[in-house]
């Protein structure tokens, strides 16, 4: 029967008694930077080309005995998970292996850098189809390793890495912390985060998604027909590398940003038990388990968006946090969140010719997060319209006044330390849909975009008094681009998007002593692209 | 872009006085930074990745590496250039004493220096 991990990543329409998805990734080359591998293992023979690249440190210990099967163990298993004949994800993908880890599974940042450079030079000398680079390794945070990954990603290479097995914030490790890399955490057959001894999978905002990573059957270097079960975020990353290979084989022109958005979009949502993660990391960690798309073509019509959390601002009075989208993504909205509730909102601002989302801490606050909603919107022309604090009783408002521009997000930012002491308007008159409305003491920022066929609508859900959280979701066929809270009072901790749901968090009414007058409303802006839908229909 | 003393020969460098003066200072007064792994057991002191500014050419990288070697030799230190990077990042990998970091950070074109560290199979 089909191994649990292959079943988990397979959409129901492919599930027969065996795993045989349509395209095995045959147009894609997957580079594996790992230990040496047994390339003639029955499971992978002819699929893996062992390059002559080797850069490894000497093994520790004077009595270390180099046993070939042990030296090859990690890499052979991963090659099998990516492209193995019987237990592999992308059975048609061809692989190239570089040895950067020694027989004890240890390497260096410098060796990895030289390996990445080798791949780039190979790509320049002999350009092939799409390239996926699998980095099933982790070290401490490294500026230079992250920079090298960024350069390779900008050269059109898809990098996939293990989040790390340290039961820790993945942002403290490299290459897991590199924003351009697809960072993968590990889950088990019960969709729980994987525990590995006293440790386990890493988590946090630097993880893009999770994938099967416990008891994964794959090629064993013990013999040419042997299989073995291994666990770790390397195994999880290998699944995503395989899925990426299959997606790229079906659509070779996909950019890294498009691929990442598709991986997120087709993942199983909200199946991981978040209680396993430290409380402060739960909101930051994506509840996504990787899966193959139900059909290899035809996802192009969708408006894809993802949520990007910033690093924590830190607690100083003027501290700010910045969340950035990838180069070919559009920032369609910006929100902020603070566990203490002490924040001064957020604003979208230009930085280096690109919009970023900046959140502001408030005096006495423990710090804030900026949350960017990053979307794929071809031929988009977006701008930010700002209205300064109105000071008048009806609140501040701003709308998209340019012809053909639609509202995709609202942000508000205030200078006063605590909006809660400044009574908000009791009534909020309904304006036109292209309008942001906010507290009279706040400046309001509207994200206005023009893109072919783009249409958006506002959806609200309010409750009379805060109860921890209010949510509002976009319906099928619409994508959440903006998420904000009304009003911006002190008991609102912030707003953020989780998949297609806008979540507004607030302090419980019992702890704040708020009145029902301070109703909290979650405001979602839901968009879709008629242009993308039409283009896709014309292709079919 | 080439720095004004980029064409100096190693021999000339070697003959200059101990107080190398302004020629060693990074251009535009920016200070290169040093980075190392926060996890102490994973550090590999003695090997450093010297990362040069983005537009640095391979020839400049090689020249900067030679300059470091020459200046280190004058101070009585042996250094070994293990690899010159180009294609992804400009720079070089050098085996040297940590005592030379201050000197290396002042070299022209240097953006930052990172001490090598371990990575592990996951």
């Amino acid at each position: 029967s089909i191994p649990w991990n292959l079943e988990r990543i397979t959409p129901p329409r492919y599930r027969a008694d065996e795993y045989q998805p349509p395209d095995g990734g045959s147009l894609v080359e997957v580079y594996l930077l790992d230990t040496s591998i047994q390339s003639d293992h029955r499971e992978i023979e002819g699929r893996v080309m062992v390059t002559d690249f080797e850069n490894v440190p000497e093994e520790d210990g004077t009595r270390f005995h180099r046993q070939a099967s042990k030296c090859d163990s990690h890499g052979t298993h991963l090659a099998g998970v990516v492209s193995g004949r019987d237990a592999g994800v992308a059975k048609g993908a061809s692989m190239r292996s570089l040895r950067v880890l020694n027989c004890q599974g240890k390497g260096t940042v410098s060796g990895t850098l030289i390996g990445l450079e080798f791949i780039r030079k190979s790509q320049l000398v002999q350009p092939v189809g799409p390239l996926v680079v699998l980095l099933p390794l982790a070290g401490g945070y490294s500026r230079v390793l992250n920079a090298a990954c960024q350069r390779l990603a900008r050269a059109g290479v898809v990098l996939v890495t293990a989040a790390g097995n340290f039961r820790d914030d993945a942002c403290l490790y490299s290459p897991a912390s590199a924003p351009e890399v697809i960072t993968v955490g590990a889950t088990n057959a019960q969709d729980q985060p994987v525990t590995l001894g006293t440790l386990g999978t890493n988590f946090g905002r630097c993880v893009d998604l999770f994938a099967p990573g416990e008891d994964i059957i794959g090629a064993s270097s013990d013999c040419s027909t042997c299989f073995v079960s291994q666990s770790g975020t390397s195994q999880a990353a290998a699944h995503v590398a395989g899925i990426a290979a299959m997606m790229l084989s079906a659509e070779p022109e996909l950019t890294l940003a498009e691929l990442r958005q598709r991986l997120i979009h087709f993942s199983a949502k909200d199946v991981i038990n978040e209680a396993w993660f430290p409380e402060d990391q739960r909101v930051l960690t994506p509840n996504l388990v990787a899966a193959l798309p139900p059909s290899t073509h035809g996802a192009g019509w969708q408006l894809f968006c993802r949520t990007v959390w910033s690093a924590h601002s830190g607690p100083t009075r003027m501290a700010t946090a910045i969340a950035r989208c990838a180069p070919d993504e559009e920032l369609l909205s910006c929100s902020s969140f603070s566990r203490s509730g002490k924040r001064r909102g957020e604003r979208m601002e230009a930085q280096g010719g690109k919009l970023v989302c900046r959140a502001h801490n408030a005096f006495g606050g423990e710090g804030v997060y900026a949350i960017a909603r990053c979307c794929l919107l071809p031929q988009a022309n977006c701008s930010v319209h700002t209205a300064p604090p109105a000071e008048a009783s009806m609140g501040t408002r701003v709308h998209c006044h340019q012809q053909g521009h639609v509202l995709t997000g609202c942000s508000s930012h205030w200078e006063v330390e605590d909006l809660g002491t400044h009574k908000p308007p009791v009534l909020r008159p309904r304006g036109q849909p292209n309008q942001c409305v906010g507290h009279r003491e706040a400046s309001i920022h509207a994200s206005c975009c023009h893109a072919p066929g783009l249409e958006c609508k506002v959806k609200e859900h309010g409750i009379p008094a805060p109860q921890g959280q209010v949510t509002v979701a976009c319906e099928e066929g619409w994508t959440l681009t903006g998420c904000s809270a009304l009003p911006g009072t002190s008991h609102v901790l912030g707003a953020y998007a989780v998949d297609n749901t806008c979540v507004v968090r607030s302090r419980d009414v019992s702890t704040t002593g708020s009145t029902s007058e301070e109703a909290v409303t979650a405001v979602a802006i839901c968009c879709r692209s008629r242009h993308l839908a039409q283009a896709s229909q014309e292709l079919q | 872009q080439e720095d004004e003393d980029g064409d100096y020969e190693e021999l000339v460098l070697a003959l200059r006085s101990e107080e190398d003066g302004l020629a060693e200072a990074p251009e535009h007064g920016t200070t290169a930074t040093f980075h190392r792994c926060a996890k102490d057991p994973w550090r590999l002191p003695g090997t450093y990745v010297v990362v040069l500014k983005e537009e640095t050419h391979l020839s400049q990288s090689e020249r900067t590496a030679r300059r470091l070697q020459a200046q280190a030799a004058r101070r009585g230190y042996l250094t070994k250039i293990l690899h010159v990077f180009h294609g992804l990042l400009p720079g070089f990998l050098v085996k040297m004493s940590g005592d030379l970091l201050e000197l290396a950070l002042k070299l022209p074109h240097v953006d930052y220096i990172e001490e090598d560290s371990s990575v592990f199979a996951q």
């Epitope: 047994q38 003639d40 029955r42 023979e45 002819g46 080309m49 062992v50 040419s224 027909t225 | -």
Partner: antibody
């Protein structure tokens, strides 16, 4: 192009040994092992075993285990199959083939065991 | 006694389609994606026609196709031609080895 070239025909007495060679070329040798298959006159194919060119590991079929030895000489890209204690039942054409997938075959070596 | 069962012979007229079956168990054909089919003309080494159940090596005519259902694999040859007359063998992985079928003689009438 990918080629497997085998040694010439052999005639052996019962109880003797035979050593057949197979020289590989045209591909990355370590990416594939070599399988040995035999075919008795008018009969089907029988898999005898496999050897790794990468590390010399072997996997022998139960039927010939103990009588067969497969070896490699990486310097000459040649693989050898030695079969001992021959009997008339071992009269067959012996083929080497690339890997377990057996996508490329040698031309075959006829081994005749006769007293 | 071969581990995989094939019909001893099949025949068909030029232009027709024929199918050769190869039956094993869940420990071989049913358990692996690696069923291969070989064509062998008299006095020649076998030639790989289908690998991994349904894949054709480059250079093999699209008239040859493979499939599998449960523990039985099949080779179908459409638009039968005189040069297709040969012996056909299936093979499959087992947990530690390889097994062949007894072979099927295809006669083109």
């Amino acid at each position: 192009q990918v080629q497997l070239v085998q040694s010439g025909a052999e005639v052996k007495r019962p109880g003797a040994s035979v050593k057949v060679s197979c020289k590989a070329s045209g591909y990355t040798l370590t990416s594939y092992g070599i399988s040995w298959v035999r075919q008795a006159p008018g009969q089907g194919l029988e898999w005898m075993g496999w050897i790794s060119v990468y590390n010399g590991n072997t996997n022998y079929a139960q039927k010939v285990q103990g009588r067969v030895t497969m070896t490699t000489d990486t310097s000459t890209s040649t693989v050898y199959m030695e079969l001992r204690s021959l009997s008339s039942d071992d009269t067959a054409v012996y083929y080497c083939a690339r890997g377990y997938g057996m996508d490329v075959w040698g031309q075959g070596t006829t081994v005749t065991v006769s007293s | 006694q071969s581990a995989l069962t094939q019909p001893a012979s099949v025949s068909g007229s030029p232009g027709q389609s024929i199918t050769i079956s190869c039956t094993g168990t869940s420990s071989d054909v049913g358990g692996y994606n690696s069923v291969s089919w070989y064509q062998q003309h008299p006095g020649k080494p076998p030639k790989l026609m289908i690998y991994e159940v349904s894949n054709r090596p480059s250079g093999v005519s699209i008239r040859f196709s493979g499939s599998k259902s449960g523990n039985t694999a099949s080779l179908t040859i459409s638009g039968l031609q005189a040069e297709d007359e040969a012996d056909y063998f299936c093979s499959s992985y087992t947990s530690t080895s390889m097994v062949f079928g007894g072979g099927t003689k295809l006669t083109v009438l």
